[in-house]
């Protein structure tokens, strides 16, 4: 009899058994039947081991030994062996940012009988692999909950009957799609031409971020550094060089491994300043022995659109004005507290209309009319008194709380013409004649 | 699998035109940056011009810029390059890529543009 | 621009030796800095974006390091499939430049 058969190897189409007699008789015979699906074949030796050649990918093989001696034979015995299904190859993978479906081929004649063991590994993370075995005769697979952006090796083997797989497996490395960024806020800086963006950092790995920023003709590109979605930490970075009061059309786009999500956009306005001081001063001319008019171009509005203009008078020297004299009144004049004071306010807004960037407006003001514009007194001017006129324009206006009325210089965004040539007022006519 | 196919190549005289074209499968052409590289006969690599993703934002080296159109269509899937008042030194293998982050990541197999009288 | 400065221009190496090829840029350029190589007649592949990443399916013989103006590219155990010119290229500010190329041939 024999017994012990063993399978020492089994590749695609080899296999090498090995058995045991009872006795050590040299003069035995080994007859073996081969037999598969695909037909038998008989064969014969003289030892007790023998390799069997020119076998079929993935196949169950039923082997038989008889012994024969003398021409007398003994017990047979048996064993069933599948050989190895060949290596899958083709290996196609489809991404999204948390799955890939992996298809493969595999091109053995008993491939309708093969389900496919998958290990997908997370590149520097080999002790925590995935395993997804297929149904027989499925060359497809989804493999979920994925990590965005990251790098995988997925290892497909072919495995058939009990677990017999193939030798070696297909091998694969895929990336996933990096996550979009969720959204990004614009913050404005205070007088500054810039827009600080902040995000916080899309879900699972990236190795950067394209910023674009586009505003008419003008645009600019530029990378990011990566970040790190572990701890939520807000991330911000501030893009200059921009103009002021502009709207800026902004687009982030995450990068990893080489691939790139769908762009993050946002639209975003730039803050304002105080408006760039004009090159002219403003034209005064008497109108009577207690009034003048004023004329003025209206401020360039490069620096955020002009929601007011102060005319401003003085009967001091022409320094360049400070924001401090907008808290004067013609109240504070006529009681000598100041030699410079507000006499009228323009707030541009109420004319309905936007003024665009390259629109210059003309302003033509009565000064001495007696009109009161919200805190400030249009008074009547002095005769044979000495005028010369100035233009605050501003951009962000804002009033004293407590002082109802007045402007809060050191809050509003203003610049200031310079001051007029001077313009001598004539004599009360009331005065000659009496 | 990214795949990128120039095509449009050819011989032209200088002053003449061409409009070379670069078809994309395999990803979301309309997510990439997009750049034309070129590589004169037996030379060295030059980026030629450069589109965004977000608004097609173009960028152009100073040799081409004036003369050289970037354009896509994401529709299609497809990225141009319109040469105009092309010169002898523009004779080179065109090839589109893909550009993240400043890296020529995945290339076409190339087209030749021979300028030429 | 920002120039990229190769060296060597040429060098040739046995079966199994560790070869490097050194990349300067002109200005810093943190570390916007990718490898390609380029067989005859082929075009340019990918092997290290960002100074050090290796791109999917480039062996783990090849290595990059470097930032700032100093980069460089370390090929471990030769290979014949190794031969090729390598070219390094600056991706910080356009225009991008590349090398002048580094022929790499099996002795």
């Known amino acids: 009899a024999v017994f012990d058969i063993h399978v020492v190897y089994v590749t695609t189409t080899e296999m090498w058994l090995d058995w045991k007699s009872p006795d050590g008789a040299s003069e035995y015979v080994y007859h073996l039947v081969i037999e598969s699906k695909h037909g038998s074949n008989h064969t014969s030796t003289y030892d007790k081991a023998i390799t069997l050649q020119g076998l079929i990918p993935g196949t169950l093989y039923n082997i038989t030994i008889s012994p024969e001696v003398d021409h007398v034979w003994g017990d047979p015995n048996s064993t069933a062996q599948y050989t190895r299904p060949s290596n899958v190859s083709n290996i196609d993978v489809s991404t999204n940012t948390t799955a890939a479906t992996l298809s493969w081929q595999n091109f053995d004649d008993a491939s309708p009988t093969y389900s496919y063991c998958l290990l997908i590994e997370k590149a520097g993370n080999s002790s925590n692999a995935t395993q997804v075995v297929t149904d027989i005769g499925i060359t497809d697979a989804t493999v979920t909950e994925l990590i965005p952006g990251s790098s995988y090796t997925v290892e497909i083997f072919a495995q058939v009957g009990d677990g017999i797989k193939s030798l070696e497996p297909g091998r694969k490395s895929f990336c996933t799609d990096p996550a979009s960024m969720a959204s990004f806020d614009c913050e404005v800086v205070p007088k500054e031409p810039a827009l600080v963006l902040k995000w916080t950092c899309p879900p699972g790995a990236n190795a950067g971020f394209e910023l674009e920023v586009s505003s008419g003709a003008w645009n600019n590109a530029t990378h990011l550094e990566s970040c790190s979605s572990e701890n939520g930490t807000e991330y911000r970075t501030e893009v200059t060089y921009l103009n002021f009061s502009t709207s800026y059309n902004i687009s982030i786009t995450t990068v990893s491994c080489g691939k790139m999500a769908a762009p993050t956009r946002n639209t975003c306005t730039t803050g304002i300043t105080d408006p760039p001081p004009p090159d002219g001063s403003p034209n005064i001319t008497s109108v009577s022995h207690n009034s003048v008019k004023v004329k003025f171009s209206g401020f360039e509005a490069s620096h955020g659109p002009i929601k007011a203009y102060a005319v401003i008078l003085t009967t001091g020297e022409a320094g360049h004005p400070s924001a401090d004299v907008l808290k004067y009144t013609y109240e504070d004049f006529k009681k000598g507290a100041s030699d410079t004071y507000v006499t009228y306010l323009i707030r541009t807004e109420e004319k309905g209309r936007s003024q665009s960037l390259s629109e210059v407006l003309k302003y033509e003001i009565d000064v001495g009319n007696e009109s009161t514009t919200l805190g400030y007194y249009n008074g009547k001017l002095e005769p044979l008194g000495s005028y010369r006129a100035c233009v605050a324009g501003f951009t962000n206006i804002t009033f004293h709380p407590q002082n109802k009325g007045l402007i809060d210089g050191a809050e509003s965004y203003v610049s200031f013409s310079r001051y007029s040539d001077a313009v001598s007022l004539p004599q009360d006519p009331g005065v000659i004649c009496g | 699998e990214v795949k990128l196919v120039e095509s449009g190549g050819g011989l032209v005289q200088p002053g003449g035109s061409l409009k070379l074209s670069c078809a994309a499968s395999g990803f979301t052409f309309s997510n990439y940056y997009m750049a034309w590289v070129r590589q004169a006969p037996t030379k060295g690599l030059e980026w030629v011009a450069y589109i965004t993703n977000g608004f097609g934002s173009t960028y152009y080296r100073d040799s081409v810029k004036g003369r050289f159109t970037i354009s896509r269509d994401n529709a299609k899937s497809t990225l141009y390059l319109q040469m105009d008042s092309l010169r002898s030194e523009d004779t080179a293998t065109y090839y589109c890529?893909?550009?993240?982050?400043?890296?020529?990541?995945?290339w076409g197999q190339g087209t030749l543009v021979t300028v030429s009288s | 621009d920002i120039q990229m400065t190769q060296t060597p221009h040429s060098l040739s190496a046995s079966l199994g030796e560790t070869v490097s090829i050194e990349c300067l840029a002109s200005e810093g350029i943190s570390n916007y800095l990718a490898w390609y190589q380029q067989k005859p007649g082929k075009s340019p592949q990918l092997l290290i974006s960002?100074?050090?990443p290796l791109h999917d399916g480039v062996p783990s013989r090849f290595s990059g390091s470097g930032s700032g103006t100093q980069f460089s590219l370390k090929i471990r155990n030769m290979q014949p499939e190794d031969e090729g010119v390598y070219y390094c290229q600056q991706g910080y500010k356009f225009p991008y430049t590349f090398g002048a190329g580094t022929k790499l041939e099996l002795k």
């Open positions: 960002h100074a050090n």
């Open positions: 890529s893909t550009v993240p982050l400043g890296a020529f990541v995945s």
